[in-house]
């Protein structure tokens, strides 16, 4: 079951999925001036059996101006521009992506990929949050959101990470705690 909405945004934080549940789709989007090849896939799909998960289909982009360039090679570093809020500079790795059954790793980039990745998540997907540079977590508790099915509708749990700047933090008494770590799990909500 696909999640109806994107994971929630929270102030001064970014999120990232560490691994993608089977059923997740990633749109094959191309950067400006490029388009999907005519017979190319619309999306990549995380599929698998009990022992192994991987991405089905390949995304391929070709120049809008030319007809038949269908190369698919790993881009040079300068082509790997910023990707969406889900791509964070310093990755938090609560689990080894490869060790999570029923999940796919982050797909490798494809040539002339769009700067922002658009995922379609499924129920049970978890994303992790981290404060952006210049902000720090008020608390080291769980920093995640989970897509859950409740009353026949999907919803993401509210992340419990609070990121404050120095000015805000100074309003509050008590010591600062270190950066959020995703050990706790606020996802165990009873569904109807």
């Amino acid at each position: 079951e696909l999640c109806d909405d994107d994971p929630p945004e929270i102030p001064h934080a970014t999120f990232k999925a560490m691994a993608y549940k089977e059923g997740t789709m990633l749109n094959c989007e191309c950067k400006r001036g490029f388009r999907r090849i005519k017979s190319g896939s619309l999306y990549m799909l995380c599929t698998g059996n009990s022992s192994h998960s991987s991405w089905d289909n390949q995304c391929q982009c070709t120049s809008s101006a030319t007809r038949n360039t269908t190369k698919q090679v790993t881009p040079q570093p300068e082509e790997q521009k910023e990707r969406k809020t889900t791509e964070m500079q310093s990755p938090m790795q609560p689990v080894d992506q490869a060790s999570l059954p029923g999940h796919c790793r982050e797909p490798p980039p494809w040539e002339n990929e769009a700067t922002e990745r658009i995922y379609h998540f499924v129920v049970g997907q978890m994303v992790y949050y981290q404060c952006v540079q210049g902000y720090r977590a008020l608390h080291r508790g769980p920093a995640e959101s989970v897509c859950k099915m409740t009353h026949g509708k999907t919803r993401w749990t509210q992340p419990q990470l609070i990121c404050t700047g120095e000015m805000e933090t100074s309003q509050f008494p008590g010591e600062e705690k270190p950066q959020a770590s995703p050990e706790g799990r606020p996802e165990s909500e009873t569904s109807c």
């Epitope: 945004e9 102030p11 608390h139 508790g141 769980p142 509210q158 805000e168 706790g184 996802e187 909500e189």
Partner: antibody, heavy 116, light 107 residues
Framework: EVQLVQSGAEVKKPGESLKISCKGS????????IVWVRQMPGKGLEWMGI????????RYSPSFQGQVTFSADKSISTAYLQWSSLKASDTAMYYC?????????WGQGTLVTVSS | DIQMTQSPSTLSASVGDRVSITCRAS??????LAWYQQKPGKAPKLLIF???NLESGVPSRFSGSGSGTEFTLTISNLQPDDFATYYC?????????FGGGTKVEIK
Amino acid sequence: EVQLVQSGAEVKKPGESLKISCKGSGYSFANYWIVWVRQMPGKGLEWMGIIYPDDSETRYSPSFQGQVTFSADKSISTAYLQWSSLKASDTAMYYCTRGPYYSDYWGQGTLVTVSS
Amino acid sequence: DIQMTQSPSTLSASVGDRVSITCRASQSIGSWLAWYQQKPGKAPKLLIFEASNLESGVPSRFSGSGSGTEFTLTISNLQPDDFATYYCQQYNSYSLTFGGGTKVEIK
């Protein structure tokens, strides 16, 4: 089903102490911030602050710092709001909610009346 | 603290009307705004978060818009159940603050 159930209405005299409670169920209570909100008679909503039940870390609104105390007992999924010396101006409805940003679940409220 | 100002404070309308409530922030808050509905003697209920995201189970006649300092809650086709008081709340800055409320009453 996620629920927050608050203790019953209280009538107190100025100078008395009071502790009201908020019991959560249907979710991992220890791992969600609990927000306290005050609503004085006929007035709007005021954010008092938050507590994280897992380790009882608290954050108070500057307006309520030193006036009230938040606490929690995660073993019984309960958060508390207390006063050591009530004033007539503490008369209000007090809500606990699940946070920390927007409040998606609310308790039914506890009416506190302070009158001599 | 960021101040939140709602207008009007009272709004008279009829069933079937389209009504709009405005909330202004004293400084930019991005899209970090929630709207709540409160009926007499009841706890508030979350309607919208992130300025325009409808909370699960809330009728689609409710919608939110705006960013920065000016936000609007719109109720299209007002229903008898919608006569209540509405509050905005910012969560860009952690102290959170609420608007003063807008009472939607029967004309």
